[in-house]
Amino acid sequence: AQNITARIGEPLVLKCKGAPKKPPQRLEWKLNTGRTEAWKVLSPQGGGPWDSVARVLPNGSLFLPAVGIQDEGIFRCQAMNRNGKETKSNYRVRVYQIPGKPEIVDSASELTAGVPNKVGTCVSEGSYPAGTLSWHLDGKPLVPNEKGVSVKEQTRRHPETGLFTLQSELMVTPARGGDPRPTFSCSFSPGLPRHRALRTAPIQPRVWEPVPLEEVQLVVEPEGGAVAPGGTVTLTCEVPAQPSPQIHWMKDGVPLPLPPSPVLILPEIGPQDQGTYSCVATHSSHGPQESRAVSISIIEPGEEGPTAGSVGGSGLGTLALA
């Protein structure tokens, strides 16, 4: 079968090979498309409702005044010339529609280095077949799931026209120290060959480099975190950042039921207070930052306490805040 592509809404003429140029002709067209159940036969006499969709011209060709999605399928013509020789023509018709120029919507004006950011959403409306959207950085294709690139795609079909709307949301994690003004663009590639890609206007968000946070320091009094029963331990969370972040406390990895405070006081120490404590500083512009963990232990009279608090992983405590 010969492959024919036709643009939706445009006319299409299919030649019936071997047919006499004018009547009388012995030919018939058979169609198997989205409009037919199995095969539909059309003859030169025509007439009836099919004439508005497809009719046989005086020269035997089949004329479709405006092809639609339902006209995709197989078209066959069987003709006999004046000498009784039979010729068959066989066409596979596929239709297409080029969408409008794709656009990037909800685009970010600023990205933060080192963390995932939404760059924007590329939208293409009115394509058939669906086609694909792809993203480019500085003119080079971006590969999803590589180097902090992720793409969320959505395809919707219009219930009446049957045309497709494509959406593609790009998330990237810009490298620290990378290009401060990267250029992103998006292109639509049609589902049928021989049609060039359509590209959006580029966007150039700024990349903001967060200043590395200074470390959160946890100071224990008495030093070493070893205390006799009934004594008091004071934990102080020191954060150089301004404005002061909110400080929460953890014990053995679990948040303590305390209001935010840079100081945690454990008065009248008992066995229940032994464990690993840390503080978590939450900045409005950054995520939470956890201190080192310190161990609080009880020394029985006569025991020597450790000279420094032992350091562990994360830990949240059960202390009273001051």
Epitope: P257, P259, I265, L319, A322
Partner: antibody
Framework: QVQLQQSGAELVRPGTSVKVSCKAS????????IDWVNQRPGQGLEWIGV????????NYNEKFTGKATLTADKSSSTAYMQLSSLTSDDSAVYFC??????????WGQGTSVTVSS | QAVVTQESALTTSPGETVTLTCRSS?????????ANWVQEKPDHLFTGLIG???NRAPGVPARFSGSLIGDKAALTITGAQTEDEAIYFC?????????FGGGTKLTVL
């Protein structure tokens, strides 16, 4: 011995404010938290919020944000709860309680607040 | 908001062991709920008994103990006494606020 002494009963008009006090004695005031809890007539207990008298840090039950304001005066070892824009729904007995990290141990005797026109 | 459920009433006899429980609508009670138990006697006399699931408050008799039993917090009185007749409230911590149960009226006959 540890004591939390609350201010006396209040009869107030709707739309006004009231400030309930809780004077602590017998311990280091800034080493412990003060929670506030209420009990409406015939009802259970409801947590209002907590203050750390040492740092002034607070945490409120969402329901009482904007209704209750917790403060503490270190010099007098007194915690305060101010209730604003009072309605009859705010009629209750209000308690302060000392908390050591995760244990509410000592409670005040309660302050009855009646809102009536 | 989470709902905390307790038995409405229990009766025991002097010298018996009785267990009160505290259930959370959000699932199993864990140590990170820091279960507290508070006793209320007539005239709004409240006393904290247990905090942090199993830590006895200062001056609380050893017959009161806190624990987790299955998916609930529990207060056990081993050898109940007549003066233990009271209403017992539990409170559970949910990330940033406490929620109290409705209370259990314990009668010691």
């Amino acid at each position: 011995q540890v004591q939390l002494q609350q201010s006396g009963a209040e009869l107030v008009r709707p739309g006004t404010s009231v400030k309930v006090s809780c004077k602590a004695s017998g311990y280091a005031f800034t080493n412990y938290l003060i929670d506030w809890v209420n009990q409406r007539p015939g009802q259970g207990l409801e947590w209002i919020g907590v203050i750390n008298p040492g740092s002034g840090g607070t945490n409120y039950n969402e329901k009482f944000t904007g209704k209750a304001t917790l403060t503490a005066d270190k010099s007098s070892s007194t915690a305060y709860m101010q209730l604003s824009s009072l309605t009859s729904d705010d009629s209750a007995v209000y308690f302060c309680a000392r908390r050591r990290v995760d244990t509410m141990d000592y409670w005040g005797q309660g302050t009855s607040v009646t809102v009536s026109s | 908001q989470a709902v905390v459920t307790q038995e409405s009433a229990l009766t025991t006899s002097p010298g018996e062991t009785v267990t009160l429980t505290c259930r959370s609508s959000t699932g199993a009670v864990t140590t990170s709920n820091y279960a507290n138990w508070v006793q209320e006697k007539p005239d709004h006399l409240f006393t904290g008994l247990i905090g942090g699931t199993n830590n006895r408050a200062p001056g609380v008799p050893a017959r009161f103990s806190g624990s987790l039993i299955g998916d609930k917090a529990a207060l056990t009185i081993t050898g109940a006494q007549t003066e233990d007749e009271a209403i017992y409230f539990c409170a559970l911590w949910y990330s940033n606020h406490w929620v109290f149960g409705g209370g259990t009226k314990l009668t010691v006959l």
